[in-house]
């Protein structure tokens, strides 16, 4: 459920209308990432990359569909892409799930977590 | 204060159009969908679909998708409504809505409505 | 699309009585943990006004006379006690699924 600690670590997030944070990544019409990844911090490589996912999983964003699409987003891949995976969907499902079903880009979604701040290590 | 303020009454033809706006003050604009609601006389309400003025995304109900149009213009914080081929059908009054993208912007529903527009189609 | 049915149509309470409107879904409306079921209370010639958000969430200045519960495709808004301002018509609405739909109404009768 929306908890009050789930709202506190949103509350958290929240992107400051005079400092939004800038990404270098940019989506095309079709939703496609136009954009050099690797200059990227690497929560914000994860966002965009589980993100993205989600978006082409399903046909319509709603809070089934994409509740949905969430369960099965980090099946794929390698065993370490997997755990980084759900641990994102863990902190993340409810507000990610919202800025899809509202229509927000992956880029909004993601700049809004401020996950776009550089930041080291391996995806 | 949070208003949604709505423009006035409209009389038309049948066939014609009619574009109806909802100028929100005292709140971030980008950071709430627009939605739109029709209520027949002495009927219940009918949701129509609604825009998101960030990304521009919007969503219909698929029994409005034909004839209507959903826009909005950031810079005055001003969502509008376009219904085409008028019928008696669409008399009505069309109500705007705020809900917001996520759900620690506020309460996760349509949490402000605008006084409404009342639309007449006759001959 | 997910109909809503609100029961009963129409329902007349003593002045200090309790009021149950109920919603029933004809699916699910529940997402990751959440019910995306919302009511509203509409008087004549106003638009409608949030009660109560996600099931069971009291909107901020709202009386604490009224409760919402429920899950899945069973939800109740409860006035208790009922004043004579609360005599209005009133709608459960979801946002689960595509496209939101609202219930048929409840016209509330204060006696």
């Known amino acids: 459920r929306l908890s009050p600690e789930y709202y506190d670590l949103a509350r958290a997030h929240l992107r400051d209308e005079e400092k939004s944070c800038p990404c270098l990544a940019q989506e095309g019409p079709q939703g496609d990432l136009l954009t050099k990844t690797q200059e990227l911090g690497a929560d914000y490589r994860t966002c965009l990359t589980i993100v993205q996912k989600l978006k082409k999983m399903v046909d319509k964003p709603t809070q089934r569909s994409v509740s949905n699409a969430a369960t099965r987003v980090c099946r794929t891949g390698r065993s370490a892409w997997r755990d980084v995976c759900r641990n994102f969907m863990r902190a993340y499902q409810s507000r990610v799930t919202q800025g899809l079903v509202a229509g927000e880009t992956a880029q909004q979604i993601c700049e809004d977590l401020r996950l776009c701040i550089p930041s080291t290590g391996p995806l | 204060e949070v208003q949604l303020q709505q423009s006035a009454a409209e009389l038309a033809r049948p066939g014609a159009s009619v574009k109806m706006s909802c100028k929100a003050s005292?709140?971030?604009?980008?950071?709430?969908?627009m939605h739109w609601v029709k209520q027949r006389p002495g009927q219940g309400l009918e949701w129509i679909g609604f825009i998101n003025p960030n990304s521009g995304y919007t969503d219909y109900n698929q029994k409005f998708k034909d004839r209507t149009t959903l826009t909005a213009d950031k810079s005055s914080s001003t969502a509008y409504i376009q219904l085409t081929s008028l019928t008696s059908e669409d008399s009505a009054v069309y109500y705007c809505?705020?809900?917001?993208?996520?759900?620690?912007?506020?309460?996760?529903?349509?949490?402000?409505w605008g006084q409404g527009t009342s639309v007449t189609v006759s001959s | 699309d997910i109909v809503l049915t609100q029961s009963p149509a129409s329902l007349a309470v003593s002045l200090g009585q309790r009021a149950t409107i109920s919603c029933r879904a004809s699916e699910s409306v529940d997402s990751y943990g959440n019910s995306f079921m919302h009511w509203y209370q509409q008087k004549p010639g106003q638009p409608p006004k949030l009660l109560i958000y996600l099931a069971s969430n009291l909107e901020s200045g709202v009386p604490a006379r009224f409760s919402g519960s429920g899950s899945r495709t069973d939800f109740t808004l409860t006035i208790d006690p009922v004043e004579a301002d609360d005599a209005a018509t009133y709608y459960c609405?979801?946002?689960?699924?595509?496209?939101?739909?609202f219930g048929g109404g409840t016209k509330l009768e204060i006696k």
């Open positions: 809505a705020r809900h917001p993208i996520y759900s620690d912007y506020g309460p996760y529903a349509m949490d402000y």
């Open positions: 609405q979801q946002n689960n699924e595509d496209p939101w739909t």
């Open positions: 005292g709140y971030t604009f980008s950071r709430y969908t």
